[in-house]
């Protein structure tokens, strides 16, 4: 499911429950995706020892995964709500091609991988409604994404395992940073 249990329109309208605010809905959606990532990481970590490797050991890779930096305005120091929101949405849009790559990478967690992908699309929609400055958000080029996907899928098995691990870890870190920032807004 692309939204957490209790998040569809029927449930939200139920008389015994207060409708969630936009911020609460976004918060819950991120936590739901993080739970999904956690399940996917369990499968990848059981298959290889990459999860035990330090970040430094895995730093040398050609992936251009989105990452939060001081200039993005999402950290406590230099916090800027609008700049940060643009970064979060832009980053999530950039992660979409990597989430597409993950779709055929799991055996027992195939549905979970799909749920993470679909839930992220829903999260982007929620955040776009919240953002005032949509013009500042750059959408990735579909042609570039298609060639990146082809390149990633052509890697040998070991590199594909490494790529899967790095995508999940980076996406987790990006969402955690986003959640910390959104809770300050």
């Amino acid at each position: 499911a692309p939204v957490p249990p209790g998040e569809d329109s029927k449930d939200v309208a139920a008389p015994h429950r207060q409708p969630l605010t936009s911020s609460e809905r976004i918060d819950k959606q991120i936590r739901y995706i993080l739970d999904g990532i956690s399940a996917l990481r369990k499968e990848t970590c059981n298959k290889s020892n990459m999860c035990e490797s330090s970040k430094e050991a895995l730093a040398e890779n050609n992936l251009n995964l989105p990452k939060m930096a001081e200039k993005d305005g999402c950290f406590q120091s230099g916090f800027n709500e609008e700049t940060c929101l643009v970064k979060i949405i832009t980053g999530l849009l950039e992660f979409e091609v990597y989430l597409e790559y993950l779709q055929n990478r799991f055996e027992s967690s195939e549905e979970q991988a799909r749920a993470v992908q679909m839930s992220t699309k829903v999260l982007i929609q929620f955040l776009q409604k919240k953002a005032k400055n949509l013009d500042a958000i750059t959408t990735p080029d579909p042609t570039t994404n298609a060639s990146l996907l082809t390149k990633l899928q052509a890697q040998n098995q070991w590199l594909q395992d490494m790529t899967t691990h790095l995508i999940l870890r980076s996406f987790k870190e990006f969402l955690q940073s986003s959640l910390r920032a959104l809770r300050q807004m």
Partner: antibody, heavy 118, light 110 residues
Framework: CQSLEESGGRLVTPGTPLTLTCTAS????????VTWVRQAPGKGLEWIGI?????ETAYATWAIGRFTISKTSTTVDLKMTSLTAADTATYFC??????????????WGQGTLVTVSS | AYDMTQTPASVSAAVGGTVTIKCQAS??????LSWYQQKPGQRPKLLIY???TLASGVSSRFKGSGSGTEFTLTISDLECADAATYYC????????????FGGGTEVVVK
């Protein structure tokens, strides 16, 4: 066996800067969040700050500008400036396994005592 | 700010008895609350996280409950070894706060 150890605590005079170091054994700090907490003699736990990745930090309102946390793969430093007698405390570092979104500290060092006195 | 208020400051009970410690957050923190035990001269030890999940190796005599702003730690079948100070800690947001921890509750076992 995984453990954390703080070092650098000593007697200093007011105004002296001091750096405490948290060192990990049995695991790499780069995969974890690390927080600093202090406890004045006979008082409760007081949260100081946390470092997430290599460059994202958060601090208690009273610690901003006077305390700085930085990280390498093996250590996490707490730099303290403009120390006063009120900063006299045992300083603990603690690990957050960073697997979830909520902060919880599941591995603690034994603490290092900082005494500020003239 | 997410201020944590812990009550009572001190509580006394007999061996075999039960004590209840309360922790109140100034704003909702979902279930993102942990409880720690600290004995004199020792480091704190994580007991419970996510309001009700027991940390590894912790006795089931410790029970956490609550969500939103109201939380409770219950220690049943008290043992002498339970004499300690207990702290709650919010893990919801560590930005713009004075302290993530509650003020602590001293448990005296008679």
């Amino acid at each position: 066996c995984q453990s954390l150890e703080e070092s650098g605590g000593r007697l200093v005079t007011p105004g002296t800067p001091l750096t405490l170091t948290c060192t990990a054994s049995g695991f790499s700090l780069s995969n974890y969040y690390v927080t600093w907490v202090r406890q004045a003699p006979g008082k409760g736990l007081e949260w100081i700050g946390i470092i997430y990745g290599s460059d994202e930090t958060a601090y208690a309102t009273w610690a901003i500008g006077r305390f700085t946390i930085s990280k390498t793969s093996t250590t996490v430093d707490l730099k303290m400036t403009s120390l006063t007698a009120a900063d006299t405390a045992t300083y603990f570092c603690a690990r957050d396994d960073s697997s979830d979104w909520d902060a919880k500290f599941n591995l603690w060092g034994q603490g290092t005592l900082v005494t500020v006195s003239s | 700010a997410y201020d944590m208020t812990q009550t009572p400051a001190s509580v006394s009970a007999a061996v075999g008895g039960t004590v209840t410690i309360k922790c109140q957050a100034s704003q909702s923190i979902n279930n993102e609350l942990s409880w720690y035990q600290q004995k004199p001269g020792q480091r704190p030890k994580l007991l419970i996280y996510r309001a009700s999940t027991l940390a590894s190796g912790v006795s089931s005599r410790f029970k956490g409950s609550g969500s939103g702003t109201e939380f409770t730690l219950t220690i049943s079948d008290l043992e002498c070894a339970d004499a300690a100070t207990y702290y709650c800690q919010q893990g919801y947001s560590l930005r713009n706060i004075d302290n993530a921890f509650g003020g602590g509750t001293e448990v005296v076992v008679k």
